[in-house]
């Protein structure tokens, strides 16, 4: 039975040209996490692996960059990395956790971080 | 099998700049964060700062900024750090540790820094 | 920054004893908290992450709970290789930081 739970930043918005963290925690659960993958929309961006540390993909070398701890930082945000983003927990044994961040890049500078939210 | 394997005992007067270095082998150094994290004799761990050698990526203590220069050389697997304007202050064992986002997991014997007039 | 607490200080046990530690952030730090050890003139050594998952090579008979804000390392059934210094450390946010450490030493 799963019963851990995954917390999230959720929704949040920054400024184009800034940076912002991407954070998830997975909590009530002594499940082994083996891997965290983190993807937008259907593209992965990045894996920590528990034995391997971490990849970037290519295409995002250069604007991301991992930590802190499973979480992952979005460097010179530009409009077009407004969407959602998810983070995968694999665990061992309770199988997969996922949580969800909605981001706003905006253009001027009323960025708010959004309140923190659970999914269980 | 993962090792970090630390430059030696350092002895500089102040005002000098010492730099030392972190030689990892049995893993891909690319993949993990290198923290540096000093000790003075008889006190708890401080944490300077971190590089990403995957794409040099550098994060800092506030306290050590203009204090600590940290870079890698991905051909030679090697992180460093490079200490400026030492003070008595200064004087700790500094250790070299990786962290793949599962804690940090892998430390290196340290480097002892004497800074003596 | 995030500020961590250890208490106690120093920690007399006789062998055999079972023992908790301590660490309380300034701060929620969900579960991203990681427990070492370091004896007399060694390196730290990782024995717990992320609040509650062992680590390989371990003994079991470390463990460690807590969620938000309190924290807590447990020795069940102390040993005389296990007396040296214990501190927290937090992988929330940066800048990463440290507790100041407790003492465990032999009664």
């Known amino acids: 039975m799963m019963t851990g739970t995954i917390e999230t930043t959720g929704n949040i918005s920054a400024e184009k040209g800034g940076s912002i963290i991407l954070q998830c925690h997975l909590s009530s659960t002594t499940a082994q996490v083996t891997q965290v993958n983190w993807e937008q929309q259907d593209q992965l961006l990045a894996i920590c692996n528990a034995d391997l540390g971490w990849h970037i993909s290519p295409s995002f070398k250069d604007r991301v960059a991992p930590g802190p701890g499973l979480g992952l930082t979005l460097q010179s945000l530009t409009v077009n990395d407004t969407g959602e983003y998810f983070c995968i927990y694999h665990t061992y044994p309770d199988g997969t956790y996922t949580g969800r961040i909605f981001l706003e890049v905006l253009e001027s500078s009323v960025a708010e971080h959004g309140a923190r939210f659970q999914i269980p | 099998e993962v090792q970090l394997q630390q430059s030696g005992t350092v002895l500089a007067r102040p005002g000098a700049s010492v730099k030392m270095s972190c030689k990892a082998s049995?893993?891909?150094?690319?993949?993990?964060?290198m923290h540096w994290v000093k000790q003075r004799p008889g006190q708890g761990l401080e944490w300077i700062g971190g590089?990403?050698?995957?794409?040099?990526?550098?994060n800092y203590n506030q306290k050590f900024k203009g204090k600590a220069k940290l870079t890698a050389v991905t051909s030679a697997s090697t992180a460093y750090m490079e200490l400026s304007s030492l003070t008595n202050e200064d004087s700790a064992v500094y250790y070299c540790?990786?962290?793949?986002?599962?804690?940090?997991?892998?430390w290196g014997q340290g480097t002892s820094v004497t800074v003596s007039s | 920054d995030v500020v961590l607490t250890q208490s106690p200080a120093t920690l007399s046990v006789t062998p055999g004893d079972s023992v908790s530690l301590s660490c309380r952030a300034s701060?929620?730090?969900?579960?991203?908290l990681h427990w070492f050890q370091q004896k007399s003139h060694e390196s730290p050594r990782l024995l717990i992450k992320?609040?509650?998952q062992s680590i390989s090579g371990i003994p079991s008979r470390f463990s460690g709970s807590g969620s938000g804000t309190d924290f807590t390392l447990s020795i069940n059934s102390v040993e005389t290789e296990d007396f040296g210094m214990y501190f927290c450390?937090?992988?929330?946010?940066?800048?990463?930081?440290f507790g100041g450490g407790t003492k465990l030493e032999i009664k």
């Open positions: 590089v990403y050698p995957g794409n040099s990526n550098t």
């Open positions: 992320y609040s509650s």
């Open positions: 701060q929620t730090i969900s579960n991203n």
């Open positions: 049995g893993y891909s150094i690319t993949s993990y964060w």
């Open positions: 450390q937090q992988s929330y946010s940066w800048p990463y930081t």
């Open positions: 540790t990786r962290e793949g986002g599962y804690g940090m997991d892998y």
